[in-house]
């Protein structure tokens, strides 16, 4: 991989504290190896949907099926784990939705919900109508697979009825679940038919079965819990951005770079330039100029705006993002047309990122 020479004494290091960025936390979908996974792109009014994995364009293959707003992965493997995104392109704008896929031996997905509506789950029966246990709210039990970040709280619910009122007990991996089986124990709220575990850890992974029974019968329901741990992650850039653009001499143009990073990202916009009529220095490395970088004096660093462009502004523009873990970069080309030619938005070509695993 080539490095580069810098012109005009610019530096690729932050000279001032970087700007703060609000980082989104994507949903997590979990599958076991060998299983199939289907995810629907949760964006409305999408004319065209494109998919990426870890910032790289995702196309159909023998295991990946893309149909409308659905992504299907057949026979999932751990290599399918990563940060996915679907981008809905509309006539006036585009929008991206991120989600994580985690393929592990423990399957699951989801997060906790409040217990604000639990009272109606406790159903009282006419004392004469003897009845075996039954589920009163199956909607709250549909999500069997729960992938939860370590340290979060997990709640499993099995709202039930019956006469006489059934009792509820919990099993972990088919065996009686005792308080001493986990540090900090757990809570059972019989009124809400729920099991609550706070500050989950990897050893909490497994199958949790509620057994609801009275003298007339017994029913059970199993949830699967996966505890997702995290490691520091280098930046990920949205595929297809920045996009190639064209404008006439004197026109304005904007390049956009969308960044996903847990850690503080430092964003730089860099352009290949000429020095003394040469694009390369005596060491054979290209001359590069830092046009903009995130810091106190720069506005939204994810956008590079060029005004009143000249032919000299044509060329390749690189969005380079680094954090303390690593870096990523993607580039786009600006074409500057003579005044008499009408400008047209070029077909958006996905630039190949230089950080493919």
């Amino acid at each position: 991989r080539p490095s580069f020479s810098l012109v005009e004494d610019t530096t690729l290091e932050p000279e001032e504290p970087p700007t703060k960025y609000q980082i989104s936390q994507p949903e997590v979908y979990v599958a076991a190896p060998g299983e199939s996974l289907e995810v629907r792109c949760l964006l409305k009014d999408a004319a065209v949907i494109s998919w990426t994995k870890d910032g790289v364009h995702l196309g159909p293959n023998n295991r990946t099926v893309l149909i409308g707003e659905y992504l299907q992965i057949k026979g999932a493997t751990p290599r399918d784990s990563g940060l996915y995104a679907c981008t809905a392109s509309r006539t006036v704008d585009s929008e991206t939705w991120y989600f994580m896929v985690n393929v592990t031996d423990a399957i699951s997905s989801g997060d906790d919900e409040d217990d604000t509506d639990g009272a109606e789950d406790f159903v009282s029966e006419n004392s004469n109508n003897k009845r075996a246990p039954y589920w009163t709210n199956t909607e709250k039990m549909e999500k069997r697979l729960h992938a939860v970040p370590a340290a979060n709280t997990v709640k499993f619910r099995c709202p039930a009825g019956g006469n006489p009122m059934p009792t509820m007990r919990w099993l972990k991996n088919g065996k009686e679940f005792k308080q001493e089986h986990r540090i900090g124990g757990y809570k059972v709220r019989n009124q809400h038919w729920s099991l609550i575990m706070e500050s989950v850890v990897p050893s909490d992974k497994g199958n949790y079965t509620c057994v609801v029974e009275n003298e007339y019968g017994s029913i059970n329901h199993t949830y699967h819990l996966d505890v997702v741990e995290r490691s520091p992650h280098r930046p990920i850039l949205q595929a297809g951005l920045p996009a190639n653009a064209s404008t006439v001499v004197g026109g304005d143009v904007e390049f956009v770079c969308k960044v996903y990073s847990d850690a503080q990202p430092h964003i730089q916009w860099i352009k290949h330039v000429e020095k003394n009529g040469s694009k390369y220095g005596p060491d054979g490395l290209p001359y590069l100029k830092v046009l903009k970088h995130s810091g106190i004096n720069s506005s939204n660093a994810e956008v590079l705006a060029l005004f009143n462009v000249t032919e000299a502004d044509a060329g390749e523009y690189i969005c380079k993002v680094s954090n303390y873990i690593g870096q990523a970069n993607q580039s786009a080309w600006l074409t500057v047309l003579p005044k008499q030619q009408a400008p047209g938005r070029e077909k958006e070509i996905t630039a190949s990122p230089d950080y493919l695993e």
Partner: antibody
């Protein structure tokens, strides 16, 4: 599992240079920064600088700029830290650490003594 | 440079105790703080990154919190193997600076 293995202890005279190596395995070398941190005897941790093996980008702590040089050999997944014009106060354990400071080398003791 | 001021510099506690170590940054570092444990003659070990994310394999008794300039590492119930020196670090901007350390000793 990522692993960083550093070169052995060194004894140097004041004014000399030392070059410490850090061999990476178990992960894609070019995808993560490689940091260098030092710790003087009985003291705290001090960040010296980083190199990104994907393109040789470097960032130095101003305190070490001009005296420390960070390089990599991608063919062997090895990073190097060279410190020149050594003085007695450079006596320390020098650590390499992967990008997120999630995996560290075992440390290399550099003793500067006349 | 961003200064990281850790307190206390040393602390005596007993097995089973709840221990809190604090770190104050000289400027806003959002949640870009990590915590490390180091035992004599050993390399530091990452415990917490991005202020509150526990690193893989770190026991749940370790937790991190805070944002902006004030950060906390809590050990909910001290175990014998937890007696060590703890460092905070900001990874917001270069140079990445560490606190001076908190030595946790057996009472």
């Amino acid at each position: 599992q990522a692993q960083l293995v550093q070169s052995g202890a060194e004894v140097k005279k004041p004014g000399a240079s030392v070059k410490v190596s850090c061999k990476a395995s178990g992960y894609t070398f070019t995808n993560y920064n490689l940091h260098w941190v030092r710790q003087a005897p009985g003291q705290g941790l001090e960040w010296m600088g980083l190199i990104y093996p994907g393109n040789d980008d470097t960032s130095y702590n101003q305190k070490f700029r001009g005296r420390a040089t960070l390089t990599v050999d991608r063919s062997t997944s090895t990073a190097y830290m060279e410190l020149s014009s050594l003085r007695s106060e450079d006596t320390a354990v020098y650590y390499c650490a992967r990008g997120g400071f999630d995996y560290w080398g075992q440390g290399t003791l550099v003793t500067v003594s006349s | 440079d961003i200064q990281m001021t850790q307190s206390p510099s040393s602390l005596s506690a007993s097995v089973g105790d709840r221990v809190t170590i604090t770190c104050k940054a000289s400027q806003d570092v959002t949640t870009n703080v990590a915590w490390y444990q180091q035992k004599p003659g050993k390399s530091p070990k990452l415990l917490i990154f991005s202020a509150s994310y526990r690193f893989t394999g770190v026991p749940s008794r370790f937790s991190g919190s805070g944002s902006g300039t004030d950060f906390t590492l809590t050990i909910s119930s001290l175990q014998p193997e937890d007696f060590a020196t703890y460092y905070c670090q900001q990874h917001y901007g270069t140079p990445y600076t560490f606190g001076q350390g908190t030595k946790l000793e057996i009472k």
